[in-house]
């Protein structure tokens, strides 16, 4: 299973649920569905209040039980480490895959943290992070921001990912804007 890691803003906007949580238990495999579930302890929710309604406490995260079908395998054994988890809701359950954005909270830049807590949501409705994977690539719309991190640095952990968000400048126009300057 291979996928291009998304820009964190794309992960935020395309997810039903974005939370901060600790992985606290040994994964269990369901003998019927062949999905495994990880027990988590949610510490913060950044997106999904409306989708969840009253059931605002997520206790488990679900993923296919094998790597070849995009299952997520949690390698950290540190049960006190917090992770940012961006996933999809299916039948009221939080699902993630290899392609989901799951990262240690401490590994995120201050700008990314600001993005998840406040700023990425501003760009969700109108703006699109457009990956540039090979030259030439050009903007297809004024609401697109060209994401060149992978092209220039061979990594999704480049400058645009760590420090910028694609936000509305004016109606019909989105541009890369620094998240640094917005950090209190």
């Amino acid at each position: 299973c291979t996928c291009v890691p998304p820009h964190p803003q794309t992960a935020f906007c395309n997810s039903d649920l974005v939370i901060r949580a600790k992985f606290v238990g040994t994964p269990e495999v369901n003998q019927t569905t062949l999905y495994q579930r990880y027990e988590i302890k949610m510490t913060k929710m950044y997106k999904g209040f409306q989708a969840l309604g009253d059931a605002a406490d997520i206790r488990f995260v679900y993923t296919p039980a094998m790597e070849s079908v995009c299952g997520y395998f949690h390698r950290s054994h540190n049960r006190s480490e917090e992770f940012l988890i961006a996933g999809k809701l299916q039948d009221g359950l939080l699902h993630i895959t290899t392609c989901s954005f799951v990262a240690p909270w401490n590994s995120l830049s201050l700008a990314q943290r600001r993005g998840f807590t406040k700023t990425y949501t501003v760009g969700c409705e109108e703006c699109t992070v457009f990956p540039c994977l090979s030259i030439p690539c050009k903007l297809q719309s004024g609401t697109h921001c060209l994401w060149t991190d992978q092209l220039l640095q061979g990594s999704e952990k480049g400058f645009q990912s760590r420090h910028l968000a694609c936000l509305p400048r004016e109606p019909g126009l989105c541009t890369w804007q620094s998240l640094r300057s917005q950090i209190a």
Epitope: T26, V29, Q31, T32, T33, M66, E67, V69, F73
Partner: antibody, heavy 114, light 111 residues
Framework: QVQLVESGGGLVQPGGSLRLSCAAS????????MSWVRQAPGKGLEWVSG????????FYADSVKGRFTISRDNSKNTLYLQMNSLRAEDTAVYYC???????WGQGTLVTVSS | DIALTQPASVSGSPGQSITISCTGT?????????VSWYQQHPGKAPKLMIY???NRPSGVSNRFSGSKSGNTASLTISGLQAEDEADYYC??????????FGGGTKLTVLG
């Protein structure tokens, strides 16, 4: 009680095909994932393929990927393994197993030889 | 392609205790509590003796016990009896390969 009965084994030439069946009884078939496991003569056990209860998730060992196809018919309580492009190294007793392998059948012998 | 490492053979006298080890990685034995042990007599299908690391199916003697520490699981048979002579296989759930087995251990009951 739980029962798994394999059938369909036999002698087949290299490059040939065979379809194994596993008839299940004594439990709610659709509530369990199922697997095929094989054992070559005098050798150890090797997991071959697995399928979820609803047939949505399907897994294969690298050694059979692209040649074998696992499927199930929950209305007939039956698990299948379609084996194509058979090789001499596929010779083994094939077992079907329930869930995370708590119950096994008695096995069916597949011999690939010219 | 054996995924889990077991000793090829172990032996013991009637009444003794023996332990068979099964070593894997953090993506199989170490990462999940899904280790099983099977007993196989010649020409027979494998029989489940231990599941989920340390649980015994009904009908299996309490002389059989299982445990796990890190990436290594163990099967202990106490009060060894002649009928325990067989091949023993460990098996674990594995995230990369779904289900993996050890190469098998031949248990010989001496005398």
């Amino acid at each position: 009680q739980v029962q798994l009965v394999e059938s369909g084994g036999g002698l087949v030439q290299p490059g040939g095909s065979l379809r194994l069946s596993c008839a299940a009884s004594g439990f709610t078939f659709s509530s369990y994932a199922m697997s095929w496991v094989r054992q070559a003569p005098g050798k150890g056990l090797e997991w071959v393929s697995g399928i979820s209860g609803n047939g949505v998730l399907i897994f294969y060992a690298d050694s059979v990927k692209g040649r074998f196809t696992i499927s199930r018919d929950n209305s007939k309580n039956t698990l299948y393994l379609q084996m194509n492009s058979l090789r001499a190294e596929d010779t083994a007793v094939y077992y079907c197993a329930r869930g995370l392998m708590d119950y096994w059948g008695q096995g069916t012998l597949v011999t690939v030889s010219s | 392609d054996i995924a889990l490492t077991q000793p090829a053979s172990v032996s013991g006298s009637p009444g003794q205790s023996i332990t068979i080890s099964c070593t894997g990685t953090s993506s199989d034995v170490g990462g999940y509590n899904y280790v099983s042990w099977y007993q196989q007599h010649p020409g027979k299908a494998p029989k489940l003796m231990i599941y989920d690391v340390s649980n015994r199916p009904s009908g299996v003697s309490n002389r059989f016990s299982g445990s796990k520490s890190g990436n290594t699981a163990s099967l202990t048979i106490s009060g060894l009896q002649a009928e325990d002579e067989a091949d023993y296989y460990c098996q674990s759930y594995d995230f990369v390969r779904f289900m993996v087995f050890g190469g098998g251990t031949k248990l010989t009951v001496l005398g």
